[in-house]
């Protein structure tokens, strides 16, 4: 998948664009909004009817090196009595994000953009039931 | 980040951390080609905390289209198909990295940007307090 070129319908390429070798692009990894703090709802992963846990994956050759993944705690959902109801399903909700991958080839280092699928949390769904003959 | 130990014959000039600016290949290593959540699953309709998906488009960003979830109800759908307001539909939010064209409109020059997206909704049992 290539990053789409800027469409002429939107705008002309400005003169001020930096020169970039063919087949590559310049990427500044100083993150915009890096220090923006978001107020996430506290403990939703524990209070949800489809609760989940978090695990941190670490890769020194990825930027950012730390990616947090959620895993649903149960197959079913937690009912009003606090018991698991397996007539319902806890399912993962996923979102793609971009990371930069560092690759070593001999003595040279190259960088590659990569899409990573992150499991963000879980939701409780009504299963679609099929009766097999 | 710390680099993996490499061939000892290589000159050790590389910074242990990622440099501030890198040249990257235009091809994105991508096993996950389906970016439309409506096509990937129907959880948004079958959840007890269903949500609608809104298209957010920005040609100055990659990906230019991001789908934002908005919970359909304040409460959650119970076994009878009615909204139970003793429970809460709550958005699950995630910070993701996208590319922002910088300088603006440039085809091959980007900066990473962190944005907060609502990915879906989950049903939550709130702790109840009676205010004196």
């Amino acid at each position: 998948r290539k990053i789409p070129k800027v469409g002429h319908t939107f705008f002309q390429k400005p003169e001020s664009c930096p020169p970039v070798p063919g087949g590559s692009m310049k990427l500044d990894i100083g993150i915009i909004n890096e220090n923006q703090r978001v107020s996430m709802s506290r403990n939703i992963e524990s209070r949800s009817t489809s609760p989940w846990n978090y695990t941190v994956t670490w890769d020194p050759n990825r930027y950012p090196s730390e990616v947090v993944q959620a895993q649903c705690r149960n197959l079913g959902c937690i009912n009003a009595q606090g018991k698991e109801d397996i007539s319902m399903n806890s399912v993962p909700i996923q979102q793609e994000t971009l990371v930069v991958r560092r690759k070593h080839q001999g003595c040279s280092v190259s960088f590659q953009l990569e899409k990573v699928l992150v499991t963000v949390g879980c939701t409780c769904v009504t299963p679609v039931i099929h009766h097999v003959q | 980040g710390i680099t993996i130990p490499r061939n000892p014959g290589c000159p050790n000039s590389e910074d242990k951390n990622f440099p501030r600016t890198v040249m990257v290949n235009l091809n994105i290593h991508n096993r996950n080609t389906n970016t439309n959540p409506k096509r990937s699953s129907d959880y948004y309709n079958r959840s007890t905390s269903p949500w609608n998906l809104h298209r957010n488009e920005d040609p100055e960003r990659y990906p230019s289209v991001i789908w934002e979830a908005k919970c359909r109800h304040l409460g959650c759908i119970n076994a009878d198909g009615n909204v139970d307001y003793h429970m809460n539909s709550v958005p699950i939010q995630q910070e993701i990295l996208v590319l922002r064209r910088e300088p603006p409109h440039c085809p091959n020059s980007f900066r990473l940007e962190k944005i907060l997206v609502s990915v879906g909704c989950t049903c939550v049992t709130p702790i109840v307090h009676h205010v004196a």
Partner: nanobody
Framework: EVQLVESGGGSVQAGDSLRLSCAAS????????FGWFRQTPGKEREFVAG????????EYANSVKGRFTISRDNAKNTVDLQMDSLKPEDTAVYYC?????????WGQGTQVTVSS
């Protein structure tokens, strides 16, 4: 700690209007939604109306749709319930509810009496 102050209850005739107000103070940040429930003796509390803080999306019980209107003032952390065309069956104790997603605060309630 969160405080909720309800006001505007009272006794009216059928067809009249009343406006309930609820003000939140204290650590009322990260509001999910703000709204009203009501309860009549011997019955469970029922949802009346709610407004989502992030986008002002509103939801109403079928029994009050078209007659009641909920609105909010973000700056003041207040929510109002405009009740028009009141009916005797609207008689109840009305409770303000402040919802912070995983924690919910209930007010003490204000009595609304509608006589025919």
């Amino acid at each position: 700690e969160v405080q909720l102050v309800e006001s505007g209850g009272g006794s009216v005739q059928a067809g009249d209007s009343l406006r309930l107000s609820c003000a939140a103070s204290g650590r009322a940040n990260s509001i999910n939604w703000f709204g009203w429930f009501r309860q009549t003796p011997g019955k469970e509390r029922e949802f009346v109306a709610g407004i989502r803080w992030s986008d002002a999306y509103t939801e109403y019980a079928n029994s009050v749709k078209g007659r009641f209107t909920i609105s909010r003032d973000n700056a003041k952390n207040t929510v109002d319930l405009q009740m028009d065309s009141l009916k005797p069956e609207d008689t109840a104790v009305y409770y303000c509810v402040l919802d912070l997603s995983t924690v919910r605060y209930w007010g003490q309630g204000t009595q609304v009496t509608v006589s025919s």
